[in-house]
């Protein structure tokens, strides 16, 4: 493993990375669930959307989220061409014109209505910690991931490589 500095090293230039092109390279409609198979659901309450983490009843339909994948160039630290590879950034939209946003001050994940171009707070770096699990790292706050806290989505600081595989920041994407 690579210790605390490893996470910081991975993400040190995240906020400097530039998204190449304004259109996504692909889009994917999927349901989002936690590592423990709880569903992420979205409910309209008092003209704003709330995000819940809950067990669904047997035949209850899962909410779908549109994931838009964007390519992002990462500034170089060692390669001669100025770019040290590409990252995948995603935006997550459960319903038209609404996107998940990172509220770094409140350490919360919120649904905001906004127009394109989307703000940086709506972009998350996609990580595969396992072959069938993904994690979402804030573009605006390297080392901070979407996670589950008290049956809600929250922003969780990951300060060591061991914690990158913590179950509460792992999510499953499913087409069903």
């Amino acid at each position: 493993a690579f210790g605390i500095s490893g996470v910081q090293k991975y993400t040190r230039a995240l906020h400097d990375s530039s998204i190449t092109g304004i259109s996504p390279i692909t889009e994917y409609l999927a349901s989002l669930s936690t590592y423990n198979d709880q569903s992420i659901t979205f409910a309209l309450e008092d003209e704003s959307y709330e995000i819940y983490v809950e067990d669904l009843k047997k035949d209850e339909k899962k909410d779908k989220v549109l994931l838009s994948y964007y390519e992002s160039q990462h500034p170089s630290n060692e390669s001669g061409d100025g770019v040290d590879g590409k990252m995948l950034m995603v935006t997550l939209s459960p319903t038209k014109d609404f996107w998940l946003h990172a509220n770094n001050k409140e350490h919360s994940v919120e649904l905001h209505k906004c127009e394109k171009p989307l703000p940086d707070q709506a972009f998350f770096v996609l990580h595969n910690m396992h072959s069938n699990c993904v994690s979402f790292e804030c573009k605006t706050d390297p080392g901070v991931f979407i996670g589950v806290k008290d049956n809600h989505l929250a922003l969780i600081k990951v300060d060591s490589s061991e914690n990158l595989c913590t179950e509460n920041i792992l999510f499953k994407l499913s087409e069903t």
Partner: antibody, heavy 122, light 107 residues
Framework: EVQLVESGGGLVQPGGSLRLSCAAS????????MTWVRQAPGKGLEWIAS????????YYPDSVKGRFTISRDDSKSTLYLQMNSLRAEDTAVYYC???????????????WGQGTLVTVSS | DIQMTQSPSSLSASVGDRVTITCLAS??????LAWYQQKPGKSPKLLIY???RLQDGVPSRFSGSGSGTDFTLTISSLQPEDVATYYC?????????FGGGTKVEIK
Amino acid sequence: EVQLVESGGGLVQPGGSLRLSCAASGFTFNNYWMTWVRQAPGKGLEWIASITYTGGGTYYPDSVKGRFTISRDDSKSTLYLQMNSLRAEDTAVYYCTRANYYYNTYGGFPYWGQGTLVTVSS
Amino acid sequence: DIQMTQSPSSLSASVGDRVTITCLASEGFSNDLAWYQQKPGKSPKLLIYAASRLQDGVPSRFSGSGSGTDFTLTISSLQPEDVATYYCQQGSKYPLTFGGGTKVEIK
């Protein structure tokens, strides 16, 4: 320039062991998933093993599970494939490959080594 | 496991011809589909990823399309240097699987 250089191939008897190495350079090694792919003489490509960028997860097809072990040493920017209980059907060129993007598996394998030949024969 | 069936297994076409290779998946998946070119004695080369994205440095005569279970690689105008074997590969579900390959020759 991204470079992947495999070594460690050779002739080995059935039941024997071999360790392949892949020396990586030109990129930040510990940001990428790495994968081994093999190709038997005159045949197609077969995925053999993958390891997460953290090194915390490893994946294999049934054909090699329990016999092959993928590992990485980020301090040396080197990928390994330990092959035990080798069989004649493991005879192939073994390629080391790198994922397309930081941190995840999406997007195929844009970088391949030159390959190292493993021959299992008595 | 997702089986990837490529067709045809081989083809012969004239320089300048439009060539189409198909890859049929045994079950649907997201578009994490790549195409590779492999020349004799060489390592494979990534041509297309995300089903339709052209890898840097690959000539624009190569294109990819498709989703779900049906994917296509097209060479709009076959060139002598395109003689090779072409493979599709799905990266959506483990185990990762490749198609059996399509050998392309010049008439």
